[in-house]
């Protein structure tokens, strides 16, 4: 079986240690400088040579797959970029995964794959949680309660940290429309210690599998494999992924031909990223150049603004950001079913937000 993801994870782990703990992303190489002079010189080249060796060893079982060719070309580019020679030392095998906060205290060891329990034992209080969501055109609610409507096209990262990578791929809702809708979601749960093998989940419109890419429904054969699980209450329209080892719950829904993403994640996990991973819609919201104001909506189809408001008001009585995004979506798409996406996003926020006072956000424009 193709184990290229293991090579990717080992490379990420080895560059993590070079950069003092920040993740480099699977093929970013961590940039030029890095702490301690490791990255950009001998350290990164050793890691890249190890990565190249690992991918070469997977060639027999991966050579026909995209992940293999992406890795091969990525390594090639990075070796050229960092002037690495083909011959030379390789990195030692990396540790199994990033350590969770509080490791090493004198308390009896809590279950390393139960983030909440472990955090509570080590800190004497439950962890803090953050919520982010993307739905509709897409509208993004960031961890910091910014609410933006984005015109992003193509693939954009919602999250990119040491534990999780979430990418949404969007395309225009209709010919000539500024607004876009999410058609595909890719989630990578990164290899971690004794808890999980690296797992990839991909959802596309009309294809919400209740399994990871490798067909499994948990984190693999490691002792804590059950700390990552996937289930559904409504096949084809809803998937819930529980990642107890990082205190995370993700909900993916399909409504009106688009995908919605919602996450509740432990604060330390959400914030475990480096400067190179600065583009995350869940962290910074949409980049200013990619934001749509409500004045930019262009109606399509026969739905008037009054009808859209009435349709949205039924499920969203408070005229908050969810209500306004619902009106926006219904107007632009001409599809009343878009009310469901905003309603579901509000329900997820109600379930996921630690502070319900922040449930209703009110847009400034």
């Amino acid at each position: 079986q193709c184990k290229i993801l293991r090579c990717n994870a080992e490379y990420v782990s080895s560059t993590l240690s070079l950069r003092g703990g920040g993740s480099s992303g699977a093929l970013r190489g961590g940039g030029g400088g890095g702490r301690g002079g490791g990255v950009g010189s001998g350290g990164l080249c050793r890691a890249l040579r190890s990565y190249a060796l690992c991918t070469r060893r997977t060639a027999r079982t991966c050579r026909g797959d995209l992940a293999f060719h992406s890795a091969v070309h990525g390594i090639e580019d990075l070796m050229i970029q960092h002037n690495c020679s083909r011959q030379g030392p390789t990195a030692p095998p990396p540790p199994r995964g990033p350590a969770l906060p509080g490791a090493g205290s004198g308390l009896p060891a809590p279950d390393p794959c139960d983030y909440e329990g472990r955090f509570s034992r080590l800190h004497g209080r439950p962890p803090g949680f953050l919520h982010c969501a993307s739905f509709g055109d897409p509208h993004v609610r960031s961890f910091h309660h910014h609410f933006h409507t984005c015109r992003v096209q193509g693939a954009w990262p919602l999250l990119d940290n040491d534990f999780l990578f979430v990418q949404a791929t969007s395309s225009p809702m209709a010919l000539g429309a500024n607004a876009t809708a999410t058609r595909k979601l890719t989630i990578i749960f990164k290899n971690m210690q004794e808890c999980i093998d690296q797992k990839v989940y991909q959802a596309e419109v009309d294809n919400l599998p209740v399994a990871f890419e490798d067909g499994s429904i948990n984190g693999g054969d490691r002792p804590g494999g059950s700390s990552l699980s996937i289930q559904t209450a409504n096949p084809g329209n809803h998937v819930e992924i529980q990642a107890a080892y990082i205190g995370t719950t993700i909900i993916i829904r399909q409504t009106a031909g688009q995908l919605s993403f919602s996450i509740k994640v432990a604060e330390d996990v959400a914030m475990a990223f480096s400067a190179e991973q600065d583009l995350q819609l869940c962290v910074g919201g949409c980049p200013p150049s990619q934001r749509l104001s409500r004045s930019e909506r262009n109606r399509r189809g026969a739905i008037t603004i009054d009808t859209a408001r009435r349709l949205c008001k039924e499920g969203l009585p408070v005229e908050d950001a969810y209500f306004h995004s619902c009106v926006f979506d219904v107007l632009i798409s001409g599809d009343p079913n878009f009310t469901v996406a905003a309603q579901a996003a509000l329900e997820d926020a109600r379930a996921f937000l630690p502070d319900l006072e922040k449930l209703h956000l009110f847009p400034s424009d």
Epitope: Q1, R57, T61, D65, H69
Partner: antibody, heavy 115, light 112 residues
Framework: EVQLVESGGGLVQPGGSLRLSCAAS????????MNWIRQAPGKGLEWIGM????????HYADSVKGRFTISRDNSKNTLYLQMNSLRAEDTAVYYC????????WGQGTMVTVSS | DVVLTQSPLSLPVTLGQPASISCRSS???????????LEWFQQRPGQSPRLLIY???TRFSGVPDRFSGSGSGTDFTLKISRVEAEDVGVYYC?????????FGQGTKLEIK
Amino acid sequence: EVQLVESGGGLVQPGGSLRLSCAASGFTFSNYGMNWIRQAPGKGLEWIGMIYYDSSEKHYADSVKGRFTISRDNSKNTLYLQMNSLRAEDTAVYYCAKGTTPDYWGQGTMVTVSS
Amino acid sequence: DVVLTQSPLSLPVTLGQPASISCRSSQSLESSDGDTFLEWFQQRPGQSPRLLIYDVSTRFSGVPDRFSGSGSGTDFTLKISRVEAEDVGVYYCFQVTHDPVTFGQGTKLEIK
């Protein structure tokens, strides 16, 4: 859930042609190499060939080289096997399977070559 | 081409008893990097093949732990620690180390 559904099998005369299809769902088809494997009645498994995720390379067993062609349409999540110059010994159940090395298989489609 | 020879071709087993299938290769399946790419498939009556074991000894997702694989070089073994009724079918070894990939001729496991 990974699903592969083969179709297009049937009865064909020696020397004839047939095109098999394999509809894929439950995984990102365009990310994976794909294989065709066959099984003659009451016999073992025989690998026929494989195609890379982007169709850039194809590999075939000597027994079908020059007669069979594997192709794919990633926009339709479909794998194909074009079989020409068919012989009696090509009679078999034909399976498509996911991955450079096959992990998930379809249920198969029967091809009978007989006059 | 690499020839994989399985034995026995037929294996009658009592329910609850262990079973062992051998697969011998005409040449070493160890690659130049030291990896060995040998897999085992199960084909139940009337069904398509299902992957059980890859890389000689790693169980595929969802495969019960009563199945185990071992071996190196040219000699490989699939073991079932306690045979259950659902294990009836034909078992194939499959090598990926050398082109073209090849299957063993199959071993039919039946209940005594």
